[in-house]
């Protein structure tokens, strides 16, 4: 328990005075927060929170979902915490199966344990398949398992959190990793035709094709030296993972002489931008 020099506000005191507590499913959780300036208890698991304004937190029949961090806070904003594991052989993992990873970043598989005394807390591939050889992870019983430096190749990887218990493996529910690619090159842009010669009243239609690793690429048709918003229509396709194509079609239904000029198809992503132009000449 914390000790502070006299005169300074001190953090609350929690009974039982330990950082971690293990209780069995069905048993009572009884936590006492002692502080003259007690404000609240906060319970947190899988980043969700609940509050209790009573200084004694009592859960008569503990369930696996009562596993988590219990924090007592006083009026000075000082706090103290205890982590409670509710050991339930039927529910070894608490899970949130939403799993997204940004390429080259770490991502957390949220499967905290309800029993810290199991062994070999790790990730396993679904249906007995091995994990990618370069997949590295760091287990944390209170948070889950952190996958380090997500690769594009891990997209739609099927995973289980796993522990060993009484000689066998116990698997969590399935997680499907969805990888958002990092932009490592500018978009590829092309235009259906580099120049057009039309008579007044004819329809002008030009298509720009934008290719990139994801639909997050931004694209627009612009008229050079003009801020006017051009009307464009889109079609898009995913040709498998990380191979996205968009066609942006610009149409002027009845071209006029003053529509003549240079039109630019511009695309950008977080790596950089690219553009391609087409020239329209309208004669009367």
């Amino acid at each position: 328990q914390p000790s502070v020099s006299p005169g300074e506000p001190s953090p609350p005191s929690i009974h039982p005075g330990k950082s971690d507590l293990i209780v069995r499913v069905g048993d009572e959780i009884r936590l006492l927060c002692t502080d003259p300036g007690f404000v609240k208890w906060t319970f947190e698991i899988l980043d969700e929170t609940n509050e209790n304004k009573q200084n004694e937190w009592i859960t008569e029949k503990a369930e696996a979902t009562n596993t988590g961090k219990y924090t007592c806070t006083n009026k000075h904003g000082l706090s103290n915490s205890i982590y409670v594991f509710v050991r339930d052989p039927a529910k070894l993992f608490l899970v949130d199966r939403s799993l997204y990873g940004k390429e080259d970043n770490d991502t957390l598989v949220r499967c905290p344990l309800t029993d810290p005394e199991v062994t070999n807390y790790s990730l396993k591939g679904c249906q007995g398949k091995p994990l990618p050889k370069d997949l590295r992870f760091i287990p944390d019983p209170k948070a889950g398992i952190m996958i380090k430096s997500v690769k594009r190749a891990y997209h739609r990887l099927c995973l289980h959190c796993s522990v060993d218990q009484e000689g066998g493996s116990v698997l969590s529910e399935k997680f499907i990793l969805k990888v958002r690619p990092a932009f490592k090159a500018v978009p590829v842009v092309s235009v259906s035709k580099a120049s057009y010669l039309l008579r007044e009243g004819e329809e002008f239609t030009v298509t720009c094709t934008i290719k990139d690793v994801s639909s997050s690429v931004y694209s627009t048709w612009k008229r050079e030296n003009s801020q006017t918003k051009l009307q464009e229509k889109y079609n898009s396709w995913h040709h498998g993972d990380f191979n996205y194509e968009r066609q942006a079609t610009l149409t002027i239904s009845s071209a006029r002489v003053n529509d003549s000029g240079v039109f630019m198809c511009y695309a950008n992503n977080t790596f950089g931008s690219a553009n391609v132009t087409t020239t329209l000449e309208v004669v009367d």
């Epitope: 947190e44 980043d47 939403s98 940004k102 679904c126 739609r156 399935k174 639909s215 995913h238």
Partner: antibody, heavy 117, light 111 residues
């Protein structure tokens, strides 16, 4: 305990822009993705896009790219959506929804945006 | 984009009987046996409320009268028996692939 608070209504003029808020409580704001959904009588429910937890990356439905911009303020646990160049077609109810365990488990009450001169 | 087609568009069912709503996806929403299909209920002036997630899992607090089934492209929401409070519009939604999409909705009326 989880709550998503949205303003009830916004009245805006054509051509203007509107920035609506979604204030989150009851969970760690930076740990969950926030989605935005548009609802009109004609088009039903349409997914606008998502702002991902942690780093604030966004992904948009192509239909709303350039029309909607999603941002978040971690310090106030608030997600925002700005819609620009408003027309009558943007009149709708806009919801924020928190993604939890693969689904939209929590929704705001919605903001009714009316575009009128 | 994955298109979700709900049928019927509207449905009138007598109190105590069974209501069945179908949702067909233009392509599979399954990955490794997980169907990324969810069902929501919406009443006028309220946001959608989650009923069923991952095709067949009952959301906490939702009555067991609601059930979901199906895989790949064909999904069903069943309410059995129907109660007066179930009058609402029901939507299916997929989040297997961007952009996430919703069905057009089925309006349930209780006779």
């Amino acid at each position: 305990q989880v709550q998503l608070q949205q303003p009830g209504a916004e009245l805006v003029k054509p051509g203007a822009s509107v920035k609506m808020s979604c204030k989150a409580s009851g969970y760690t704001f930076t740990s969950y993705n926030m989605h935005w959904v548009k609802q009109t009588p004609g088009q039903g429910l349409e997914w606008i896009g998502v702002i991902y937890s942690g780093n604030g990356d966004t992904s948009y439905n192509q239909k709303f790219k350039g029309k909607a911009t999603l941002t978040a303020d971690k310090s106030s646990s608030t997600a925002y959506m700005q819609i620009n160049s408003l027309t009558s077609e943007d009149s709708a109810v806009y919801y924020c929804a928190r993604e939890r365990d693969t689904r939209f488990g929590n929704w705001g009450q919605g903001t009714l945006v009316t575009v009128s001169a | 984009n994955i298109v979700l087609t709900q049928s019927p568009a509207s449905l009138a069912v007598s109190l105590g009987l069974r209501a069945t709503i179908s949702c067909r996806a233009s392509e599979s929403v399954d990955i490794y046996g997980n169907s990324f299909m969810h069902w929501y209920q919406q009443k006028p002036g309220q946001p959608p409320k989650l009923l069923i997630y991952l095709a067949s899992n009952l959301e906490s607090g939702v009555p067991a009268r609601f059930s979901g089934s199906g895989s790949r492209t064909d999904f069903t929401l069943t309410i059995d028996p129907v109660e007066a409070d179930d009058a609402a519009t029901y939507y299916c939604q997929q989040n297997n692939e961007d952009p996430y999409t919703f069905g057009g909705g089925t309006k349930l009326e209780i006779k």
